[in-house]
C-alpha cells in the first residue's frame, strides 16, 4: 500500500472528496481549497501572496494533477476575496474566497462540502481528515495525485505551551496533532474534515512540518461564518 | 524547464570561507525543499542538509553543523551553501537538488595552500 | 542515526544479464530513493519512494523492499547502465546515502 503520503499519510481514494480544490498558478498547484457552494471555493489567503502577476485558477473533480480525468475541470477566477483583516506576517483570519467564472457542473467528483456554522470547538482528539497535494517526504517530493491523512484535534492549551504554538493560537484557530503525520508545503487552503462538515482551512503560515511540538494549524471556519455569508450573499 | 545552475568553481586557502550559489529557473524554490550534497574525490555522495526556502527552516546533518550554513533568497530563486573554516577535507564536488529530483551540475571546491 | 549498506560494493554484468543490488538499513525505513551516478556527471534520481520509477527512467529499472532491505534491479543490462548506485533513506533524519555499488559492464 502507499506510505507516507502529505506527511505519514496515504494517496487518497479517487474522487471521494469531491469538495477538493487545487488552487493553480500559471496552471501548477499552488494550494488546496474547498468547494463550498456552486461557485465559490474556500482557501487561505496567503497563497495568493505572490500570485500578482499570474493567472489564478481553480481546479476541479481532480486525483491526479496531470493525467486525463473525465471530472477534472479548470476554472478561471472572477474575483478573490481574501479576508478584510488577514496580513501577510500573521497566521490569523488567513482565509480566502474564490469565485468562479461560472458555476461549477456538480456531479459524484464535484460537489460542495457542508460547512460549520456552529462556532464550538471540535472535541480533542477527534479524529480529522486533511487532503492535499502538498509535499509528502523530507526530501520535499510533490505527488501527482489526492493525499490524505487522518488527524487528532489537539486541545488549544497544549498547542498554545510555549514549547508549541506559544500563544498564537486564538478562538478562531484550531490544531491537529503533527507527529510524523501532518499537512504540509502545498496543503495549504485545503479541508479539516471531521465527520463530514469543514471546520477546518490548513493556514499557509510557514511552519516545520511532522514535528509533535509544532502542530497543524487550521483556520475554524464557524467562526468566519457570518463574513463567509456575506461574501457568498 | 526546470534547471539548476550552480556556481562556477572555487580555489581557496586553508581558513577562508566559500559561498556557493544554486539558481533555480522553470520554478519556484518557495515550493519545495532545497538541498546540498558533498562528494569528495573518488567517494561517495554525503548529504549535507536541506532548507525550506518559504520560512529559512533548515535541518542540517549534525556532522556538517558548524561547517556548513544553507541560505535562500526567494527574490533571486537562489539556495546558498556557506561552508567555512575550510580544511582539505573539503574539497569536493557540492551538488544542489530540488527535492532530489533536480540537481545542478556541481561545483568543485579545492582547498590548498 | 541510521546506517546504509549497499552491497555488493563492486559487480560486473554482461549486456542483456538481470542484475540485483542491495541496500540494508541498521533500522527499520519506509521511503528508499536510488540515484544512479555516471563518472563526471551529477546523479540522477531513479527511484522514488521505495517503487516508484522517476520521469524517464527506463522500465528496465525497478526497486523493491520494506523495513530494513530494500533493492534496485535491472531487468536487462545495457552498456549505458554503467555507473555508481546510490540508495538514501527518507524516513529518519538525519538522511544519509548508501555506500554506493559500482556497477560494470563486462
Known amino acids: 500500500p502507499p506510505r507516507g503520503r502529505i506527511l505519514g499519510g496515504r494517496e487518497a481514494e479517487a474522487h471521494a472528496r469531491p469538495y477538493m480544490a487545487s488552487v493553480q498558478l500559471n496552471g501548477a498547484h499552488l494550494c488546496g481549497g474547498v468547494l463550498v457552494a456552486e461557485q465559490w471555493v474556500l482557501s487561505a489567503a496567503h497563497c495568493l501572496e505572490d500570485a500578482a502577476d499570474g493567472k489564478v485558477q481553480v481546479l476541479l473533480g481532480a486525483h491526479s494533477l496531470s493525467q486525463p480525468e473525465p471530472s477534472k475541470r479548470l476554472y478561471d477566477v472572477l474575483r478573490a476575496v481574501p479576508h478584510p483583516d488577514s496580513q501577510p506576517d500573521t497566521i490569523d483570519h488567513d482565509l480566502l474566497l474564490l469565485q468562479l467564472s461560472e458555476k461549477a457542473t456538480l456531479g459524484p467528483a464535484v460537489r460542495p462540502l457542508p460547512w460549520q456554522r456552529v462556532d464550538r470547538d471540535v472535541a480533542p482528539g477527534t479524529l480529522c481528515d486533511v487532503a492535499g497535494w502538498g509535499i509528502v517526504n523530507h526530501a520535499g517530493r510533490r505527488p501527482d495525485s489526492l493525499q490524505h491523512v487522518l488527524l487528532p484535534v489537539l486541545d488549544r492549551a497544549t498547542c498554545n505551551r510555549r514549547t508549541h504554538h506559544d500563544g498564537a493560537i486564538t478562538e478562531r484557530l484550531m490544531c491537529a496533532e503533527s507527529n510524523r503525520r501532518d499537512s504540509c508545503k502545498g496543503d495549504s487552503g485545503g479541508p479539516l474534515v471531521c465527520g463530514g462538515v469543514l471546520e477546518g482551512v490548513v493556514t499557509s503560515g510557514s511552519r516545520v512540518c511532522g514535528n509533535r511540538k509544532k502542530p497543524g494549524i487550521y483556520t475554524r471556519v464557524a467562526s468566519y461564518a457570518a463574513w463567509i455569508d456575506s461574501v457568498l450573499a | 524547464e526546470v534547471q539548476l545552475q550552480q556556481s562556477g568553481a572555487e580555489f581557496v586557502k586553508p581558513g577562508a570561507s566559500v559561498r556557493l550559489s544554486c539558481t533555480a529557473s522553470?520554478?519556484?524554490?518557495?515550493?519545495?525543499?532545497m538541498h546540498w550534497v558533498k562528494q569528495r574525490p573518488e567517494q561517495g555522495l554525503e548529504w549535507i542538509g536541506r532548507?525550506?526556502?518559504?520560512?529559512?527552516?533548515?535541518k542540517d546533518d549534525p556532522k556538517f553543523q558548524g561547517k556548513a550554513t544553507i541560505t535562500a533568497d526567494t527574490s533571486s530563486n537562489t539556495a546558498y551553501l556557506q561552508l567555512s573554516s575550510l580544511t582539505s577535507e573539503d574539497t569536493a564536488v557540492y551538488y544542489c537538488?530540488?527535492?532530489?529530483?533536480?540537481w545542478g551540475q556541481g561545483t568543485s571546491v579545492t582547498v590548498s595552500s | 542515526q541510521i546506517v546504509l549498506t549497499q552491497s555488493p560494493a563492486v559487480m560486473s554484468a554482461s549486456p542483456g544479464e538481470k542484475v540485483a543490488m542491495t541496500c540494508s538499513a541498521s533500522?527499520?525505513?519506509?521511503?528508499m530513493y536510488w540515484y544512479q551516478q555516471k563518472p563526471g556527471s551529477s546523479p540522477r534520481l531513479l527511484i522514488y519512494?521505495?517503487?516508484n520509477l522517476a520521469s524517464g527512467v527506463p522500465v528496465r529499472f525497478s526497486g523493491s523492499g520494506s523495513g530494513t532491505s530494500y533493492s534496485l534491479t535491472i531487468s536487462r543490462m545495457e552498456a549505458e547502465d554503467a555507473a555508481t548506485y546510490y540508495c538514501q533513506q527518507w524516513s529518519t533524519y538525519p538522511f544519509p546515502f548508501g555506500s554506493g555499488t559500482k556497477l560494470e559492464i563486462k
Open positions: 522553470g520554478f519556484n524554490i518557495k515550493d519545495t525543499y
Open positions: 519512494d521505495t517503487s
Open positions: 532548507i525550506d526556502p518559504a520560512n529559512g527552516y533548515t
Open positions: 533500522s527499520s525505513v519506509t521511503y
Open positions: 537538488a530540488s527535492a532530489m529530483d533536480y
